[in-house]
Structure formats: structure tokens, C-alpha cells
């Protein structure tokens, strides 16, 4: 029988293998960001293209209001790359108190929001200094790992300095997840 295997001492029953094509997955690509208010002590979230060009959402994985919505529980690979563009800066020597971002660095965070839990959870974080770089600089930060996610979880990408995100090409800045 398909999905079953018989052994001399015991019987194991396997669920039929699920085709990869049926699994929830999404790949979102960069759009130009506009200034927005964001929560105190939280970096602003990026918004994304979800259907044009290389971007897609499939099999009940939906994108809405900066969030990827997880449609079923399971282990997901979650990833993002954000490319920052800027120019050499005179880096500030004063460390201002009460600032969520460390001066003179850029940070990307992949965050999980669960409605039943009051605080967002940081799943992944990457930081780079921008003080030692050349005159016109590009700095990609890539993050990716596997997480056990629950149906209804929401994922977003937060960055420390939204005005430095390189919006020009969809292969430079992206965000996605797929069920393993």
C-alpha cells in the first residue's frame, strides 16, 4: 500500500507524502519606503511587493499590511536580505540615550507577532557598522533560519534606518518564508 511499510516485528504507518507544490510559501520584493510613524522602541517595518515581478504568495500564505501571515502550523524557513545604500558619514561620537538604534550602525530584524502574546518576538537580527565603508556604499544584510511557527503568526522585517533601504532592484532587498 502506498504510504505504508511492513517490517517483520512491527508495522509503521506513514501519512502520504505531501507535494512541495502544495506547501505555503512566499517571496516578497522591495518597494520604495515612505516615512511612517512606528511604535516606540521598535524599528519601522518595511512594506513589500507581493505579486509583481519576482514576488508571489502561494497556498494560503498571504501578505497584508507589512505582515506575512502563516496559514498553518509547522517548521518554516524564514529569510530576508536588506541592502542599504548610503554615503560616507561623519559618524557621531555622542551616544544619545533613549535611541532604539545604535548610532552609526544599520540593523535588520525579522519579527514574529502572535496575537495571543503581547510582545513581538525577534526571530533574527543582523547589524553592520557604516563608519568604515567607502564613499558610496552598499551593505547587504542577509538573515535566514528555520522556525516552528503557529497558524496565525505574523512575520515582518524591521530596519533601523528606513531611508537607507535600496529600493531600486527586486533582487537586492527581499523577504520570504516557506513550509518545510
Amino acid at each position: 500500500l502506498k504510504g505504508q511499510e511492513f517490517a517483520p516485528s512491527h508495522q509503521q504507518v506513514y501519512a502520504p507524502l505531501r507535494a512541495d507544490g502544495d506547501k505555503p510559501r512566499a517571496h516578497l520584493t522591495v518597494v520604495r519606503q515612505t516615512p511612517t510613524q512606528h511604535l516606540k522602541n521598535q524599528f519601522p517595518a518595511l512594506h513589500w511587493e507581493h505579486e509583481l515581478g519576482l514576488a508571489f504568495t502561494k497556498n494560503r500564505m498571504n501578505y497584508t499590511n507589512k505582515f506575512l501571515l502563516i496559514p498553518e502550523s509547522g517548521d518554516y524557513f524564514v529569510y530576508s536580505q536588506v541592502t542599504f545604500r548610503g554615503m560616507t558619514s561623519e559618524c557621531s561620537e555622542i551616544r544619545q540615550a533613549g535611541r532604539p538604534n545604535k548610532p552609526d550602525s544599520i540593523t535588520v530584524v525579522i519579527t514574529k507577532v502572535t496575537d495571543s502574546y503581547p510582545e513581538p518576538t525577534q526571530l533574527l537580527m543582523g547589524t553592520k557598522s557604516v563608519c568604515e565603508v567607502g564613499s558610496n556604499w552598499f551593505q547587504p544584510i542577509y538573515l535566514g533560519a528555520m522556525f516552528s511557527l503557529q497558524e496565525g503568526d505574523k512575520l515582518m522585517v524591521n530596519v533601523s534606518d528606513i531611508s537607507l533601504v535600496d529600493y531600486t532592484k527586486e533582487d537586492k532587498t527581499f523577504f520570504g518564508a516557506f513550509l518545510l
Epitope: R99, P103, V130, V159, I162
Partner: antibody
């Protein structure tokens, strides 16, 4: 709604200094850059400098020795300080905010007149 | 510094006309070219960024094109509210630099 409002312009003596404020609303200075631009009467727009969300600054090298841009994130205000003013610094001074390459939103500007 | 040369410096046209303004950079600016509109007593408005991308809320009669050092702003059918001064600006290299503007007047 995104707004930038400049204040602090007026009549200044040659050799004096100015400190202009740019109060922003609708976004956070900790994650967005603010540029300063000026326009002298009958002249082209001139970019003065920028303060990035992460705190770094860049200046127009022609004016760098006389300019300081700073900000107070808690007050959502950016400041432009300019020293050793001369008649040719008479201009409308604008603050603007946007992405690394463009200025999406501008203030109405504040007029600075340098004259004795 | 990169020099931005904008032409013409002034232009008379009628409602419904198609208008083209050009901007030339002194070196390649890799498509980081923006266009702005300025009206007396009003805040400057971004129209087009990265050569050809329309800023949110800008009517589709505005379009941009170009590459390398040569760039163009086109208004396909002039409306009464389009009479204003237009500036180009390069965002490729600091210091950012502007063209000196094109004043678009009613014929």
C-alpha cells in the same frame, strides 16, 4: 500626515550665526534622514547637508566648516547651525525628508536675511 | 561636484500641450535622477524619482526617462495646475546637486 515646519529665520548681522529648527511630524527621526537645502534670490537650489536616521551626517564641502546639523529624536526636531554669515547666505532655507537619494517631503521654508 | 544643466530655463505653453524638459549631468548618475515641482508659497513636491518612477499621488501625465547623463521630464497634456517651476536633482553622489529650474508659463 507628514509635515516639516522650519522656524528661526529672520534678519541676522554679517558675521553672526543662525540656528534654524525643523519640527517633523508623521514619522520618526530615529529611522529617517533629513536634508537641508537653501535657495538664494534668483539662484539655484543648493544642498547643504543631511543627518541620517542612524545619526551620521554629511555636509556640502563648500560650507562644511561653517555648518552643523544635529537633532533631538525625542522632540522630533532637526537643527541647522551656520556660523560666520555673509550677505550671500541670504536665502530661503528648507528642510526635507526622504530616501537616500531623493527628498519626498519638504517644509515651506524660512527666510534668512543677512544684512547690517 | 556633479553639475546639473537643465533646459530650457523658461517655457511658454498652453493647456493640453505636451511639454519636455531636459536635464544633463556632468557625469553618469546611474539613474538616480529626481524631478520636483515648485509653486510660489507652496512646499516643493517630488514628482518622479529614480528617473521614471512616479511618486505617490502624482498624476500619470507626468513621466520621466533617460540614462547615463541625459534625462527628460515629460508632461503629456498640460493642465492649469501644472504651471510652475520644475527642478531636477541627482541623488547618486554627495553633494546632491540641482538643476537651476525650468519656469513653465502660460502662453
Amino acid at each position: 500626515e507628514i509635515q516639516l515646519v522650519e522656524s528661526g529665520g529672520g534678519l541676522i548681522q554679517p558675521g553672526g550665526s543662525l540656528r534654524i529648527s525643523c519640527a517633523v511630524s508623521g514619522f520618526s527621526l530615529s529611522s529617517y534622514g533629513v536634508d537641508w537645502v537653501r535657495q538664494a534670490p534668483g539662484k539655484c537650489l543648493e544642498w547643504l547637508g543631511v543627518i541620517w536616521g542612524f545619526g551620521g551626517t554629511n555636509y556640502n564641502s563648500a560650507l562644511k566648516s561653517r555648518l552643523t546639523i544635529s537633532k533631538d529624536n525625542s522632540k522630533n526636531t532637526v537643527y541647522l547651525q551656520m556660523n560666520s554669515l555673509r550677505a550671500e547666505d541670504t536665502a530661503v532655507y528648507y528642510c526635507a525628508s526622504g530616501n537616500f537619494d531623493a527628498m519626498d517631503y519638504w517644509g515651506q521654508g524660512t527666510l534668512v536675511t543677512v544684512s547690517s | 561636484d556633479i553639475q546639473m544643466t537643465q533646459s530650457p530655463s523658461s517655457l511658454s505653453a498652453s493647456v493640453g500641450d505636451r511639454v519636455t524638459i531636459t536635464c544633463r549631468a556632468s557625469q553618469d548618475i546611474s539613474n538616480y535622477l529626481n524631478w520636483y515641482q515648485q509653486k510660489p508659497g507652496k512646499a516643493v513636491k517630488l514628482l518622479i524619482y529614480y528617473t521614471s518612477r512616479l511618486h505617490s499621488g502624482v498624476p500619470s501625465r507626468f513621466s520621466g526617462s533617460g540614462s547615463g547623463t541625459d534625462y527628460t521630464l515629460t508632461i503629456s497634456s498640460l493642465q492649469p495646475e501644472d504651471f510652475a517651476t520644475y527642478f531636477c536633482q541627482q541623488g547618486n553622489t554627495l553633494p546632491f546637486t540641482f538643476g537651476c529650474g525650468t519656469k513653465l508659463e502660460i502662453k
